[in-house]
């Protein structure tokens, strides 16, 4: 039985997977930060985890996924307060009993040091210094992300 | 409807300790930032600390750090705020307030408590 | 620490006349700037948030302007419930900081 957050993530995921092959982004669009090959948008205004995720959506983006402690703190590094949360991609399953990121893969343990609870309804924000599990009720910011993929040169037949 | 109602104020000398409480009802308490913000006799408003609505993440003042300690439980619908070697200074009516974080307001308010520091 | 200067620190006005309280931000808060009001005895009371968004429940005569640095709290026609004091605060930074009031009182 999935939860309702479960199956939205699930739903967005799954109808991103079917949208059409997009060109691959060569640079981060206005208002979007780059760290490394990625492209983030952090919100001015506060939502609960569902609408966050959502709204990354609308802006063909995700929440934002963290491979692994260097990620995490070079993004760290761009939030200018230490009272500010944002939601990253990442919440309880409750039906497999573990974190587990939007894209659908579960929390490496060592990637990110969780301070609270691994319970239902939980999700994970992070702070200029630490990664925080909170009720995914609670209306915080949120980090949209875009890939930045290298686009190979295409060859053309003469015309 | 929204209530925050704060108890445990008093008289206390320099140095002494005491613990405030803030009962909450009338919304999911556990998805709130929730502060501290104090009121000296005649003085404007000064923010003191914050909670994230999990407990997990605490800030203060420069004034407080180190003396005071902000905590919940969630369970109990209850903020607190634990003050430790109290200074005349922090004389002043103590409010608990919904909010806290950036780029909260604190939309609702208790009626405060007067904590008196002095010999 | 980001310091919030209100000007004037007090005013006599009359019930009907129109109100205007200004708040200065030592730098740029963009728009994160909230007014409550005061009266004595009493804890504050939330009235706009964001500049310029009025708070839910909270009469049409209030209103807010201003980004950046510079905003102004207006009461368009003063009513007699409305004499009090009037804080601005800044939700840009921390420390949370709030103007040292404004006190409208009763010509």
């Known amino acids: 039985q999935k939860s309702s957050i479960e199956k939205c993530s699930v739903d967005i995921q799954q109808s991103r997977n079917k949208t059409t092959e997009r060109p691959g982004l060569l640079n981060c669009p206005i208002y979007w930060q780059q760290l490394r090959e990625k492209c983030l948008l952090f919100s001015h205004t506060v939502n609960p985890w569902n609408n966050s995720l959502a709204d990354c959506s609308t802006k063909e983006s995700s929440l934002l996924l963290i491979r692994d402690k260097d990620e995490l703190i070079h993004t760290q590094n761009l939030i200018r307060d230490k009272a500010i949360l944002f939601w990253i991609g990442l919440n309880f399953s409750l039906s497999e009993k573990n974190w587990k990121w939007i894209n659908g893969s579960f929390l490496n343990s060592n990637d990110l040091e969780i301070r609270g609870d691994a319970k239902e309804n939980s999700c994970i924000s992070i702070s200029q210094t630490s990664v925080y599990s909170e009720y995914c009720s609670t209306e915080i910011r949120w980090i949209c992300q875009k890939e930045l993929t290298p686009v190979r040169n295409k060859v053309y037949p003469d015309s | 409807e929204v209530q925050l109602v704060e108890s445990g104020g008093g008289l206390v000398q320099p140095g002494g300790s005491l613990r405030l409480s803030c009962a909450a009802s009338?919304?999911?308490?556990?998805?709130?930032?929730m502060s501290w913000v104090r009121q000296a006799p005649g003085k404007g408003l000064e923010w003191v600390s914050a909670i994230s609505g999990s407990g997990g993440s605490t800030y203060y003042a420069d004034s407080v750090k180190g003396r005071f300690t902000i905590s919940r439980d969630n369970s109990k619908n209850t903020l607190y705020l634990q003050m430790n070697s109290l200074r005349a200074e922090d004389t002043a009516v103590y409010y608990c307030?919904?909010?806290?974080?950036?780029?909260?307001?604190?939309?609702?308010w208790g009626q405060g408590t007067l904590v008196t520091v002095s010999s | 620490d980001i310091q919030m200067t209100q000007s004037p620190s007090s005013l006599s006005a009359s019930v009907g006349d129109r109100v205007t309280i200004t708040c200065r931000a030592s730098q740029s808060i963009s728009s994160y700037l909230n007014w409550y009001q005061q009266k004595p005895g009493k804890a504050p009371r939330f009235l706009i948030y964001a500049a310029s968004s009025l708070q839910s429940g909270v009469p049409s005569r209030f209103s807010g302007s201003g980004s950046g640095t510079d905003f102004t709290l207006t009461i368009s026609s003063l009513q007699p419930e409305d004499f009090a004091t009037y804080y601005c605060q800044q939700t840009y930074s921390t420390p949370l900081t709030f103007g040292q009031g404004t006190k409208v009182e009763i010509k």
């Open positions: 307030a919904r909010g806290g974080y950036l780029p909260d307001a604190f939309d609702y």
């Open positions: 009338g919304f999911t308490f556990s998805s709130y930032a």
